[in-house]
Interface confidence: low
């Protein structure tokens, strides 16, 4: 029986009965928040072999192993992941081992096993046999291995039953529990699965099979399942569904999508039966099961019952996410907020058309209206008193409307009104008149030349860069010394810079009046020598990364109608030099014959330039005789191995560890102080842990149903 679309077992352990007849869970499996320790021994689900999404275990009291619950769980496909993970075991207070002795494959995603105080048998599992890449696995905060004394079957009797593999240069037995080995297939099978008797399965099988070389005997399919057979691709007139099986059109037509979305049924697109058209596509008619590409952003019409939608917070803006046409009026009143510009862009950035009017008032948190980055038409079908369809009043920090060089905005009907926007230059308003086609509609009092721009540098001169020099992580720039009418009024310069993969940034991107700014800022004092050009060294930059840079002069002078005269540069785009790439990731090697090694790896996370080739070096190594000198299966303390440089694991030091020379010949040494990079890595690690934990809590704690 296929169960789904996701099974959430919480609070009452007897809910586990829901899994009784499941062979495949099409979706996720959550087992969580069971606070009363129960006896799980009577619960056993041998039918369950595949979970198509992920398995999450969280705070289940009394559960000591998963092996009895899911003795035949073979594959977790990871079609959808929980925060990049296909297996999450978190804060399982009584779990002693994972014990999923038949788990052979996690197709996509990593594992996260964290804060399980009693959990052992983690170092005895070779996850590289189950996952393609182990570098993203996160296994921390569990029972320290030294307190575990993990022993694989037979090692105490000196008749080891399990096979060995190498993990982190340690060649050891691999097992799930004290009596269950980790299954490995003969090397002759290559990437193929195998039966319990070590016969190779059909190439289309995944995990295991009940008979060799038979595509109808697979426990799970490598690609897709159709009519009892594992197939590399879905046959004609069938469609991929949920990442693992093939269904026909009739099946797809009769699935209704989840209640709270627009339930128009599933669609068939690109050979797949899916809940809705993918990004960039739209249904070919409301009753259609097929998708066609959108021209530009896909249209989504949003309507406000009360005609006027007030945007006074991120929450209210959230309601407009994805909307391209807004039927009604927008009243924007953002007095404060955190990271408001980018949040508003996130939720309102797709709006192209407003059918009524747009009013922006008392929005002291706004520096620019660029968050409405796709607005191209205000129809003005409904107007404010006085026939205004664009009304901007009392916005103390508004400096820019839009970047008019890259913006086409039409106001079809109605006038514009601007008053009490002290940082908004009148020239900016006049430019809007021209672009929007409203020039001549406004009467004299509609654009107040006294109280708009009264506290802004409206008459800007252009600062010119004179030189730029780059290295892998530095940029040196200089610019002409700016001379205002009275040079004593030039206070300093401010340099703004940020990463800019594309040459499309504007001065006001991500900027609001509450401190959020996507630009890094550096103040540059005037050189004391009047003949020296001002400049700056920007350091700590990333190699082979394009940065956008501009400079502003900070001045005092009040001239011409009491307006401040200032100066700023154009935005300069400049790329740092290439550098040595970081190390290639997930290096795996396997022997496929007595004279060949197959080596695979993933590209480095930081290429720091255009990668042109890889260098692979290898050398023959002698067998390490040291491995044979100690009985590793005994529970005695393993002797400390003296490494060539005299350093040892800091935890092994019991005598006085202090020596004057770190790493010298005098014996054990102190831990060297942490480098800045290590401290930063630790900080990021702690931050990442917090982010994950927040994500976990937000995902699983839900209000009680009615």
């Amino acid at each position: 029986e296929i169960c789904g679309p996701g099974i959430d077992i919480r609070n009452d352990y007897q809910q586990l009965k829901r899994l009784e007849n499941c062979t495949v869970i099409e979706g996720y499996l959550h087992i969580l928040l069971i606070s009363k320790a129960e006896d799980y021994r009577s619960y056993r689900f041998p039918k369950l072999t595949v979970i198509t999404e992920y398995l999450l275990l969280f705070r289940v009291a009394g559960l000591e192993s998963l092996g009895d619950l899911f003795p035949n769980l073979t594959v977790i496909r990871g079609w959808k992941l929980f925060y990049n993970y296909a297996l999450v075991i978190f804060e399982m207070t009584n779990l002693k081992d994972i014990g999923l002795y038949n788990l052979r494959n996690i197709t996509r995603g990593a594992i996260r096993i964290e804060k399980n105080a009693d959990l052992c048998y983690l170092s005895t599992v070779d996850w590289s046999l189950i996952l393609d890449a182990v570098s993203n696995n996160y296994i921390v905060g569990n029972k320290p291995p030294k307190e575990c004394g993990d022993l694989c079957p037979g090692t105490m009797e000196e008749k080891p039953m399990c096979e060995k593999t190498t993990i982190n240069n340690e060649y050891n037995y691999r097992c799930w529990t004290t009596n269950r080995c980790q299954k490995m297939c003969p090397s002759t099978c290559g990437k193929r699965a195998c039966t319990e008797n070590n016969e190779c399965c059909h190439p289309e099988c995944l995990g295991s099979c009940s008979a060799p070389d038979n595509d109808t005997a697979c426990v799970a399919c490598r690609h897709y399942y159709y009519a009892g057979v594992c197939v590399p691709a879905c046959p004609p007139n069938t469609y991929r569904f949920e990442g693992w099986r093939c269904v026909d059109r009739d099946f797809c037509a009769n699935i209704l999508s989840a209640e709270s979305s627009d339930s128009e049924g599933f669609v068939i697109h690109d050979g797949e039966c899916m809940q809705e058209c993918p990004s960039g596509f739209i249904r070919n008619g409301s009753q259609s099961m097929y998708c066609i590409p959108c021209e530009g952003p896909c249209p989504k019409v949003c309507e406000e019952e009360k005609k006027t939608k007030t945007i006074d917070s991120v929450t209210s803006a959230q309601m407009l996410q994805g909307c391209t046409i807004f039927k009604g009026n927008l009243l924007i009143n953002i007095r404060r907020g955190n990271n408001i510009a980018s949040e508003l862009e996130n939720f309102m950035g797709l709006i192209e058309v407003v059918t009524g009017y747009v009013k922006i008032r008392h929005s002291h948190a706004l520096v620019s209206l660029s968050f409405l980055k796709n607005l191209r038409l205000i129809l003005g079908e409904e107007q404010l008193e006085g026939n205004y369809s664009f009304y901007v009043l009392d916005n103390q920090n508004l400096q820019q409307l839009w970047d008019w060089d890259h913006r086409n905005l039409t106001i079809k009907a109605g006038k514009m009104y601007f008053a009490f926007n002290p940082k908004l230059c009148v020239s900016e308003i006049y430019r809007m008149e021209e672009v929007t086609g409203t020039k001549g509609r406004q009467s004299k009092g509609d654009i107040n030349t006294r109280n708009n721009g009264e506290r802004a540098s409206c008459e800007s001169d252009v600062l010119h860069f004179t030189s730029t020099t780059t290295s892998k992580n530095r940029i040196i720039i200089t610019w002409h010394r700016y001379r205002p009418p009275d040079y004593r009024d030039l206070i300093s310069f401010t340099v703004y810079y940020k990463e800019a993969p594309f040459k499309n940034v504007t001065e006001y991107d991500g900027q609001d009046a509450c401190g959020s700014n996507s630009w890094n800022m550096v103040d540059v004092d005037l050189p004391p020598n009047k003949d020296v050009e001002p400049g700056i060294l920007l350091h700590g930059l990333k190699p082979w990364t394009q940065y956008a840079v501009y400079v502003k002069a900070v001045t005092l002078t009040m001239v011409e109608n009491d307006h401040i005269r200032g100066a700023k540069s154009e935005i300069l785009y400049i790329r740092t030099n290439a550098s040595v790439p970081s190390i290639p990731l997930d290096v795996l090697s396997a022997s496929n014959s007595s004279s060949q090694l197959i080596v695979k790896w993933n590209p480095p996370s930081l290429p720091n330039g255009n990668l042109s080739y890889y260098i692979v070096r290898w050398q023959r190594q002698p067998q390490d005789g040291y491995l044979y000198r100690h009985n590793y299966c005994s529970k005695d303390k393993i002797p400390i191995r003296k490494y060539a440089d005299g350093t040892i694991d800091i935890e092994e030091v019991t005598e006085n560890p202090k020596t004057e020379v770190c790493g010298g010949e005098k014996g054990p040494c102190c831990a060297c102080p942490k480098t800045e990079a290590e401290k930063q890595a630790e900080k990021e690690e702690a931050e990442y842990r917090k982010v994950f934990e927040n994500f976990l809590h937000n995902s699983i704690f839900v209000p009680r149903p009615e």
Epitope: E1, C3, P5, N254, I255, L256, S257, E259, D262, S263
Partner: antibody
Framework: QIQLVQSGPELKKPGETVKISCKAS????????MNWVKQAPGKGFKWMGW????????TYSDEFKGRFVFSLETSASTAYLLINNLSNEDTATYFC??????????????WGAGTTVTVSS | DIQMTQSTSSLSASLGDRVTISCRAS??????LTWYQQKPDGTVKLLIY???RLHSGVPSRFSGSGSGTDYSLTITNLEQEDFATYFC?????????FGEGTKVEIK
């Protein structure tokens, strides 16, 4: 508690129109689909269709396309069934039923008490 | 449309009896079978969905089974409140269709 309260019985003449209401209480109307089911005297049920209470989009079974209209008044947490141009065959009890989406299917976990419509000249 | 057939339109049973009601679909409905109970006063209640899953609050004496086209509802240890009409409904293919019903009467 969760319940669907339907309007009272109706006696109509052929050719007239009837509008039946179904008021939801104890839950948010927009979170669940609302279905309409017909039961002729002494017969089984016939599913007439459903309305997506989130979007207001109705879906009608082929047999009930044309004269039948599903609608909503979200602010009043009420769903309506309108039957135009009544005929004797429309004599039946009409149930509203809240549906739960279950893995590609839909089942009806809360039912109204039914509204009896009698069409007679 | 998929036809749902409840071959027995009525059956008589005594308190404490075990009763099985069958339902056949005109084609495979992939276990998407639901059972409802209608009391003599007309009130309808959901009993079982997806062939065998007991709706919350339904007594455990009700159980469902079947696959493909043949399904059944079993009531063990029949109680007074169980005398009613039982309908099956398929949820595999639109339009959803119901059986004609099986009335369980007191012997």
């Amino acid at each position: 508690q969760i319940q669907l309260v339907q309007s009272g019985p109706e006696l109509k003449k052929p050719g007239e129109t009837v509008k039946i209401s179904c008021k939801a209480s104890g839950y948010t109307l927009a979170n669940y689909g609302m279905n309409w089911v017909k039961q002729a005297p002494g017969k089984g049920f016939k599913w007439m269709g459903w309305i997506n209470t989130n979007t207001g989009k109705p879906t009608y079974s082929d047999e009930f396309k044309g004269r039948f209209v599903f609608s909503l008044e979200t602010s009043a947490s009420t769903a309506y069934l309108l039957i135009n141009n009544l005929s004797n065959e429309d004599t039946a009890t009409y149930f509203c039923a809240r549906s739960i989406y279950y893995y590609g299917s839909r089942y009806f976990n809360v039912w109204g008490a039914g509204t009896t419509v009698t069409v007679s000249s | 449309d998929i036809q749902m057939t409840q071959s027995t339109s009525s059956l008589s049973a005594s308190l404490g009896d075990r009763v099985t009601i069958s339902c056949r679909a005109s084609q495979d409905i992939n276990n998407y079978l639901t059972w409802y109970q209608q009391k003599p006063d007309g009130t309808v209640k959901l009993l079982i969905y997806y062939t065998s899953r007991l709706h919350s609050g339904v007594p455990s004496r009700f159980s469902g089974s079947g696959s493909g086209t043949d399904y059944s509802l079993t009531i063990t240890n029949l109680e007074q409140e169980d005398f009613a009409t039982y309908f099956c409904q398929q949820g595999n293919t639109l339009p959803w269709t119901f059986g004609e019903g099986t009335k369980v009467e007191i012997k």
